[in-house]
């Protein structure tokens, strides 16, 4: 028996009542040690116990009036009072007492963290941790095995196992994502350590296998056949090839490479969207040079971990046959342009040079030539250019011609080339005065005075610099009034050979001058220099002679 520490008069046993009882249960008895059994004491419950518990007022027996659920409430704290009915007063102070609800195994284990999902790499070794599941049991863990749980695998063999006491799920057999990528595992949790009468609960775990790069890409076609026109420009797509990889995502990203292409004519790039290999033309092809190509292409993954490298040895290859299709191509001149030289003055019909164009195609069509750009030339069937007129370098030193070659088998196929004809100089022009000289001598000129400086020009082209030679004509015997001196620099001076001239005696002198060039053979011209006598006055300057001469000619005398 227990006694209340504060109130020594109360006596009761520890109260325990089982949960889940369908009938009224006797819990125990409260009594006061002052109670002598003469039925004058009355027992009362106060407070919270009113609904679930009742007390026999005469005996102090306590009863559970309804089914109790330990998992809802495991302890009840009640207050009791004892009254002596003869005097109508409490004989003991109010006291609290406790009723404990004892556990029965009425709750199954429950998985509270559902849904369970786990991801684990494919081909993970045995023993790899996948996920831990935990079941909770609401029963009293201190009451026998009511809340002692064991786990077992209901579905998932042979790939998974569960540790019975921890709920840790591990891999028990390697799995290949490419065969199956999702697994459904069912775990059962039993209380009572699985003994008879145990309650159980189950949960489902969805386990996804993540991809590892354990598959290399493989060409489904062992070879491909493409055709390309020889007129296709570089950069043209020839065709597309495709390898397949059972992996996904980054592990399926692949790279194509050309293994053997000595010609370096093809390239391959990847279409990142479709993972196709696009074969492109890197350099133009020429049917006449090579019309069949073969290239071997290798495919490999872009991202391969070192430990998975063994799965990627002996990369898959495919062979591509490329057939070049012939295009009728225009003629090709043997040179990009032609430069010919011909001396001027040659008779018409003189051969200038020969151009030549060929058909690059196999049929080797003959050519027909035509020429535009000048009526001075013509071209014959062999591509030989001839003159049709006398050429004069001093009229035109260069001719810019255009020659066209047309295939006789296909007149649509035409090409043209520039022909530059240089007319070479021959010495066919004698030198002459560089200008028309107005030369004057003053009446009061002194002997040896420079009357005029002269120079010459020559319409011929000079390989080096022209050199001119000046001489007073030997025919000009009657003219001793002037002398000529060659300066040896392509100029000469005319000097007065006497002192004083008179307008009354002679108004004008004509001096015959010979000018020779340095051509081979040299050419000489006869040139007349007119020297007019002028009244210069005291100044002895010829600056005003032109106007004076004009007035003189008009019949006036200038003072």
């Amino acid at each position: 028996d227990y006694k209340d520490d504060d109130d020594k008069g109360w006596v009761w046993k520890q109260f325990v009542v089982p949960e889940e009882m369908d009938t009224i249960q006797h819990v125990g008895r409260l009594r006061s040690d002052l109670d002598n059994g003469n039925n004058s004491f009355q027992y009362k419950l106060l407070g919270t116990g009113d609904g679930s518990f009742s007390i026999d007022e005469k005996t102090g027996d306590i009863f559970a009036m309804q089914k109790l659920d330990r998992e809802k409430q495991s302890l009840y704290i009640l207050r009791a009072q004892v009254i002596d009915t003869t005097i109508g007063k409490a004989v003991e102070p109010e006291s609290e007492f406790v009723i404990r609800v004892s556990d029965v195994n009425d709750n199954e284990p429950r998985f509270l963290d559902e849904p369970y999902e786990a991801i684990v790499p494919e081909m993970s070794p045995e023993g790899t941790f996948v996920i831990k599941v935990t079941a909770n049991d609401a029963d009293d863990p201190t009451s026998g095995y009511h809340a002692r749980i064991l786990y077992n695998l209901e579905q998932g063999q042979p790939y998974f196992s569960v540790e019975p006491t921890t709920g840790v799920i591990r891999i028990s057999s390697k799995m290949d994502r490419e065969l199956q990528d999702t697994y459904c595992v069912i775990i059962q949790a039993k209380d009572m350590l699985g003994q008879p009468g145990a309650l159980s609960g189950t949960t489902t775990i969805s386990i996804k296998l993540s991809d590892i790069n354990d598959n290399k890409p493989i060409f489904k076609e062992s070879f491909y056949r493409f055709t390309i026109s020889e007129s296709a420009p570089s950069g043209t797509t020839i065709g597309k090839i495709m390898a397949y990889d059972d992996d996904i995502g980054e592990n399926a990203e692949m790279d194509y490479s050309i293994e053997d292409d000595e010609s370096q004519i093809f390239d391959i790039v990847i279409d990142n969207e479709t993972q196709e290999g696009i074969v492109i033309l890197k350099k133009k092809v020429d049917f006449e040079h090579q019309n069949h190509y073969g290239i071997r292409v290798k495919v490999k993954n872009c991202h391969v971990d070192e430990e998975l490298a063994p799965a990627h040895v002996n990369a898959s290859t495919t062979y591509i046959k490329v057939q070049v299709e012939d295009e009728d191509e225009p003629p090709t001149f043997l040179l990009p342009y032609y430069i010919f030289e011909i001396p001027e003055g040659k008779p018409y019909g003189t051969m200038v040079g020969t151009v030549s164009a060929v058909d690059p195609d196999r049929r080797q069509s003959p050519m027909r030539y035509s020429l535009i750009g000048s009526k001075m030339f013509d071209i014959n069937g062999n591509g030989t250019i001839v003159t049709t007129n006398l050429l004069d370098r001093e009229v035109s030193a260069w001719y810019n011609l255009s020659v066209t070659a047309t295939e006789t088998y296909n007149v649509q196929q035409i090409s043209s080339a520039h022909v530059y004809v240089q007319v070479l100089n021959i010495n066919d022009h004698a030198p002459e005065f560089s200008q028309l000289y107005e030369t004057y001598v003053c009446e009061n000129a002194e002997s040896g005075e420079i009357i005029q400086t002269i120079s010459a020009i020559d319409r011929d082209e000079s390989i080096e610099d022209h050199h001119f030679y000046f001489n007073h004509s030997v025919e000009d015997t009657n003219n001793s009034s002037f002398i000529l001196t060659d300066n040896q620099d392509n100029t000469a001076v005319i000097l007065s050979n006497r002192a004083g001239f008179s307008l009354k005696e002679e108004t004008v002198f004509y001096m015959i001058i010979l000018i020779a060039d340095n051509g081979i053979p040299p050419l000489t011209s006869t040139n007349t220099l007119t020297i007019q006598v002028c009244d210069c006055g005291d100044s002895r300057s010829t600056e005003t002679c032109t106007s004076k001469e004009l007035l003189f000619i008009m019949g006036f005398k200038a003072e």
Epitope: F223, D260, Q290, H292, Y319
Partner: antibody
Framework: QVQLQESGPGLVKPSQTLSLTCTVS??????????WSWIRQHPGKGLEWIGY???????YYNPSLKSRVTISVDTSKNQFSLKLSSVTAADTAVYYC????????????WGQGTLVTVSS | EIVLTQSPGTLSLSPGERATLSCRAS???????LAWYQQKPGQAPRLLIY???SRATGIPDRFSGSGSGTDFTLTISRLEPEDFTVYYC????????FGPGTKVDIK
């Protein structure tokens, strides 16, 4: 294993047209990527390629014979044929049909050949 | 067209000896575009080597090919009695042409 068999007349008169057929067995003539050729060998001489055809019907001929040659294909019969017009005695030869390889334009499979004599 | 020249025209050797057959092209060809054939009397040619060193299916390893550019070689390391016959080279880059052949006969 692909097998090829040539058939056709063994004697053709000058100026006429030589016609031969090659029947393919052990594989489809429509197999993607393969070219079907005709090759000839003059008696005691070397080999001369005549031309080839793809199952789609596109053909390519030896330029020196191009003006006289026609090669055609009949996929339903798994056959391809050669026609060589305006024949002369110089066309007397053993005619072979052949198929190229999967790794190049070499000739991997050959028929046993048929001798065609051009004579009046 | 590319012209192939084979030398020697005839090669006289004994069984067990090494045979070296040459094939020369009139202009450069990629080594990927050359093949060798064996032809026995009354039979069709038989592919030996392509590309120029890959052996065709069923070809014994005593046959090997090499070369590049314009010069190519077929080597038979130890001649067997059945190897005494005619050998042709073929280029398949610019159209298709064959060499005139080399005859290997028993000395």
């Amino acid at each position: 294993q692909v097998q090829l068999q040539e058939s056709g007349p063994g004697l053709v008169k000058p100026s006429q047209t030589l016609s031969l057929t090659c029947t393919v067995s052990g594989g489809s003539i429509s197999s993607s990527g393969y070219y079907w050729s005709w090759i000839r060998q003059h008696p005691g001489k070397g080999l001369e390629w005549i031309g080839y055809i793809y199952y789609t019907g596109s053909a390519y001929y030896n330029p020196s014979l191009k003006s006289r040659v026609t090669i055609s294909v009949d996929t339903s019969k798994n056959q391809f044929s050669l026609k060589l017009s305006s024949v002369t005695a110089a066309d007397t030869a053993v005619y072979y049909c052949a198929r190229d390889g999967s790794s190049g334009w070499y000739f991997q499979y050959w028929g046993q050949g048929t001798l065609v004599t051009v004579s009046s | 067209e590319i012209v192939l020249t084979q030398s020697p025209g005839t090669l006289s050797l004994s069984p067990g000896e090494r045979a070296t057959l040459s094939c020369r092209a009139s202009r450069n060809i990629s080594s990927s575009y050359l093949a060798w054939y064996q032809q026995k009397p009354g039979q069709a040619p038989r592919l030996l080597i392509y590309g120029p060193s890959s052996r065709a299916t069923g070809i014994p390893d005593r046959f090997s090919g090499s070369g590049s550019g314009t010069d190519f070689t077929l080597t038979i390391s130890r001649l067997e009695p059945e190897d005494f016959t005619v050998y042709y080279c073929q280029q398949y880059g610019s159209s298709f042409t064959f060499g005139p052949g080399t005859k290997v006969d028993i000395k």
